[in-house]
């Protein structure tokens, strides 16, 4: 039994890191393998992650971690029984994929303005709480070409747009994702989408 693709890990910079790897053949990850991990810190202890299958030869492990800080470094040991298959390390702050925003809501009752709000996925004590920026994707269910991205570079989890920038009388969907420039993170997954019917009063034409 050998590791074909070494484990690569990403952290949500809160409490979970996800490591994925591939073996050189079909493997029952949960019965044959264990991933041991330990924070390099005087008061830490070793933990064991039981991997799950992720395709025939692929394995994935969800590591429960202490609250992450920038200096953290974890040692990782992948075992098959008594055999050490791979040894490595992982700095969560260098491989961050933020959590997806939640509770995306479209408020349509604000005088021909659409107000989109969502929740920051981090608690206020987390470093990323004040460092997330967002991208909002709005698209028409009727017209695949009607697809737009709004970059929200301020900290407030909201976006205002004029209803008139979208077509009236048709349904739209929106979703939002996050990233943090300070740690050069990847983008989060998209939030679940929300749907609304866009309608607004056309301004009277002046002749």
């Amino acid at each position: 039994m050998k590791v074909l693709q070494e484990p690569t890990c990403v952290s949500d910079y809160m409490s979970i890191s996800t490591c994925e790897w591939k073996m050189n053949g079909p493997t029952n990850c949960s019965t044959e393998l264990r991933l041991l991990y330990q924070l390099v810190f005087l008061l830490s202890e070793a933990h064991t992650c039981i991997p799950e299958n992720n395709g025939g030869a692929g394995c994935v492990c969800h590591l429960l971690m202490d609250d992450v800080v920038s200096a953290d470094n974890y040692t990782l040991d992948l075992w098959a029984g008594q055999q050490l298959l791979w040894k490595g390390s992982f700095k969560p702050s260098e491989h961050v994929k933020p959590r997806a925003p939640g509770n995306l809501t479209v408020h349509t009752n604000v005088s021909d303005t659409l107000l989109l709000t969502w929740s920051n996925p981090y608690p206020p004590d987390n470093y990323l709480y004040n460092h997330l920026t967002y991208a909002v994707n709005i698209w028409s269910e009727n017209d695949p070409a009607d697809f737009r991205i709004y970059n929200v570079t301020y900290l407030e989890p909201s976006l205002r747009i004029a209803a008139s920038t979208l077509k009236s009388g048709i349904s739209y969907r929106a979703r939002v994702r996050a990233w943090a420039q300070c740690y050069n993170t990847t983008w989060s997954e998209w939030s679940p989408s929300t749907k609304w019917h866009n309608s607004y009063r056309e301004p009277f034409e002046q002749h």
Epitope: S15, F41, L42, L43, S44, E45, M65, D66, D67, V69, S70, A71, D72, P123, P124, D125
Partner: antibody, heavy 115, light 109 residues
């Protein structure tokens, strides 16, 4: 908002015992290492003890064998049991949250050791 | 034991002036594990800088940290009235694992 609220200080005779408490809120207590740091009157800061999320502990040589740090994650609380107290243990004791550094501190509680 | 020596012991300056505080370690310290705190009379310390140069949440940008190895510096670019306090450096490393410098008092001239 992160808060650490301390209780349990007071006056004790040399050789006596005291238990300090620290209640945490505004963060996930169980995922954070916790510490005690003290400051003798007019002096600087001195690390006393720390406890990891899994219960691993460490002590300064000056308190080893006399002080015991513990935590109750269900109650979001940190404790310091101080036995065989000496005059040199008199200080303001702070609980703190952190790891390599201390992000948040309690308000401090004064321990006076005097006959 | 790593000993942190702060200098000067007291710094007498006027508001608006620049303050430069030094922290020297008896052995090399990883910059990832060097922090600075501010303490005012009757108050708990407050984290200013971690990882030698990263500002903690809510700390004004007039505070900056630098250095590596055995020499670290805290700089306050323009002293505000509320900055007059005692400043401590702190390291995490060898036994005992967490040690503080003896402090530098920044007082009004």
């Amino acid at each position: 908002e992160v808060q650490l609220v301390q209780s349990g200080g007071g006056l004790v005779h040399p050789g006596g015992s005291l238990r300090l408490s620290c209640a945490g809120s505004g963060f996930t207590f169980s995922r954070n290492a916790m510490f005690w740091v003290r400051q003798a009157p007019g002096k600087g800061l001195e690390w006393v003890s720390g406890i990891g999320t899994g219960g691993a502990t460490s002590y300064a040589d000056s308190v080893k064998g006399r002080f015991t740090i513990s935590r109750d994650n269900a109650k979001n609380s940190l404790y310091l049991q101080m036995n065989s107290l000496r005059a040199e243990d008199m200080a303001v004791y702070y609980c703190a949250r952190g790891r390599y550094w201390y992000n948040n501190w309690g308000q401090g509680t004064l321990v006076t050791v005097s006959s | 034991e790593i000993v942190l020596t702060q200098s000067p012991g007291t710094l007498s300056l006027s508001p608006g002036e620049r303050a430069t505080l030094s922290c020297r370690a008896s052995q090399s310290v990883s910059s990832s594990y060097l922090a600075w705190y501010q303490q005012k009379p009757g108050q708990a310390p407050r984290l200013l800088i971690f990882g030698a140069s990263s500002r903690a949440t809510g700390i004004p940008d007039r505070f900056s940290g630098s250095g590596s190895g055995t020499d670290f510096t805290l700089t306050i670019s323009r002293l505000e009235p509320e900055d007059f306090a005692v400043y401590y450096c702190q390291q995490y490393g060898s036994s005992p694992p967490w040690t503080f410098g003896q402090g530098t008092k920044v007082e009004i001239k």
